[in-house]
């Protein structure tokens, strides 16, 4: 009779997380009598994971009937995988002994690998809103997956973009692993509709990758152009001014109307119109009583958008000395504007 | 010596069954898992499935869970692996090997039965 | 599962000429235990596969030592130092670290 033998004939075993893995031994031969036990790990510190004789393992099943007299297969099921599970695993032959059975012999082992999906990629973007022709940062980050191979791509309306960082941690062997990726992506005038959006491939993922979104309304702030203007006279002694907002996001603007620097009035952006790429315009008046100057007037439009600093227009209205020729003394002067375009 | 037998050839129609043997001799059958094996007219090799014969141990490949179904007779000493519904494009040469001790795997091969699907 | 490239597909030898036979795999052979289970059969036509040599290395008895097997994690050789005439057939690479077991496309050799 020939040396018992014990067979592992599954050298290394690739199980998706939640599901059970099959761990197969067996033994050449009935003799000598004695349990068999698995372990994780080789060594003083090996873990037990499944004891013949004694012992609750709920997780664990045998595949054959262990309690035959003549049974040499003592294959196990572990279920319910998770990441944690990894490692190779030892089927070991014990030899019965008095008082304590003793090691016969070990199984090659079978290393036990495990598939974890990436959690869903979570994409934020900078703290601070940004203008156009900025440059900012947006991360991407996803967790848990095993093993360590993945891709990652980022995209901006569906071009792909080449400016970004990629890390796996850790660096070493781990039961399961995590990406963080940093992107760098320049702000135009339009983009107040685009979606950065990245991306995650993993063998786990059957070719359907995981996707994190953006949405750079969240990032971009585009300021206002001004414009003012005078119409023509409404009634013989008041003048129309208007101040055109155009293209700026997000809404929140407040316009002061100063006449010789001076507070005339102050409104908030209200009834706004969306423009197809996703600014607003938005227009205020004023109705001066040309009358009640008798000097030049200096007019003010000044838009404070987002908390950021004013910005102004200025428009010289001159008042004549001579009311009834009003009409025909209405041309306007645009002084020192301040002004910049954000999207 | 180690020695797998199987019978030479198998003509089956479209859609039937076909029950393939494997008898295993010159060792302890129940000792060692057995490996089934194919290969396509003018084609390489593709592992079918094992079996282990003490205790019916199955484990395919998933090309083929549910085309094989594998069973041994320790009695006979024999494996036997089953195809079913078979069609033109399972016709191909099926090898029993056997698995040895540590590193004594796939040394053991039968001769191969060729299955033949035809009307 | 792990996928096995054989090249070339067809090799053409001379009697006495040496030959070389490529087998890469997608994942590394090499397994916990410091062993990497790697296989090259030999299957002569009209006949069933037969081993040659086992561990990437190990020649099986019988087998003549004109022929060497070397490689590690991915990339592995078979050379034959000089072609003979029964060494004919088709060669094959079968891993058998990774489950399932799988065999490389094989490779024809051929004397010219």
């Known amino acids: 009779e020939e040396e018992l033998q014990v067979i592992q004939p599954d050298k290394s075993v690739l199980v998706a997380a939640g599901e059970t893995a099959t761990l197969r031994c067996t033994a050449t031969s009935l003799i000598p009598v004695g349990p068999i036990q698995w372990f994780r790990g080789a060594g003083p510190g090996r873990e037990l994971i499944y004891n013949q004789k004694e012992g609750h393992f709920p997780r664990v099943t045998t595949v054959s009937d262990l309690t035959k007299r003549n049974n040499m297969d003592f294959s196990i099921r572990i279920g319910n995988i998770t990441p944690a599970d990894a490692g190779t695993y030892y089927c070991v032959k014990f030899r019965k002994g008095s008082p304590d059975d003793v090691e016969f012999k070990s199984g090659a082992g079978t290393e036990l690998s495990v598939r974890a999906k990436p959690s869903a990629p979570v994409v934020s973007g900078p703290a601070a809103r940004a203008t156009p022709q900025h440059t900012v940062s947006f991360t991407c980050e996803s967790h848990g997956f095993s093993p360590r191979d993945i891709t990652l791509k980022w995209f901006k309306n569906g071009n792909e973009l080449s400016d970004f960082q990629t890390n796996v941690d850790p660096v070493g062997e781990s039961v399961s692993y995590s990406i963080h990726s940093t992107a760098k992506v320049v702000l135009t005038r339009e983009d107040v509709h685009s979606q950065v959006i990245c991306e995650v491939a993993h063998v786990t993922l059957q070719g359907d990758p995981l996707r994190g979104t953006a949405n750079l309304s969240e990032t971009i702030r585009v300021p206002p152009t001004l414009e003012v203007t005078q119409q023509p006279v409404r009634a013989e002694n008041q003048v129309n001014v208007t101040c055109q907002v155009r293209k700026f996001y997000p809404q929140r603007l407040q316009l002061t109307w100063l006449e010789n620097g001076n507070v005339s009035r102050t409104e908030t952006a209200s009834t706004v119109t969306e423009n197809k790429d996703g600014t607003y315009n938005w227009m205020s008046w004023l109705l001066v009583n040309v009358s009640a100057h008798r000097d030049d007037v200096k007019l003010t439009c000044q838009v404070e958008h987002d908390g950021q600093p004013a910005v102004s227009k200025s428009h010289d209205l001159k008042v004549s000395a001579h009311p009834k020729e009003q009409g025909s003394n209405t041309a306007a002067e645009n002084t020192g504007s301040n002004e910049r375009n954000i999207y | 010596q180690v020695q797998l037998q199987q019978p030479r050839a198998e003509l089956v129609k479209p859609g039937a069954s076909v029950m393939l043997s494997c008898k295993a001799s010159?060792?302890?059958?129940?000792?060692?898992?057995i490996h089934w094996v194919r290969q396509g007219p003018g084609q390489g090799l593709e592992w079918i499935g094992l079996?282990?014969?003490?205790?019916?141990?199955?484990d395919c490949s998933e090309t083929f869970k549910n085309k094989a179904t594998l069973t041994v007779d320790t009695s006979s000493s024999t494996a036997y692996m089953q195809l079913s519904s078979l069609a033109s494009e399972d016709s191909a040469v099926y090898y029993c090997a056997r698995d040895g001790a540590s590193y004594d795997w796939f040394v053991h091969w039968g001769q191969g039965t060729l299955v033949t699907v035809s009307a | 599962d792990v996928v096995m490239t054989q090249t070339p597909l067809t090799l053409s030898v001379t009697i006495g000429q040496p030959a070389s036979i490529s087998c890469k795999s997608s994942?590394?052979?090499?397994?916990?235990?410091?062993?990497?289970?790697l296989n090259w059969l030999l299957q002569r036509p009209g006949q069933s596969p037969k081993r040659l040599i086992y561990l990437v290395s190990k020649l099986d008895s019988g087998v003549p030592d004109r022929f060497t097997g070397s490689g590690s994690g991915t990339d592995f050789t078979l050379k034959i130092s000089r072609v003979e005439a029964e060494d004919l057939g088709v060669y094959y690479c079968v891993q058998g670290t990774h489950f399932p077991r799988t065999f490389g496309g094989g490779t024809k050799l051929e004397i010219k």
């Open positions: 994942q590394s052979l090499l397994y916990t235990n410091g062993k990497t289970y």
């Open positions: 079996i282990h014969p003490n205790s019916g141990n199955t």
């Open positions: 010159g060792y302890t059958f129940s000792s060692y898992w």
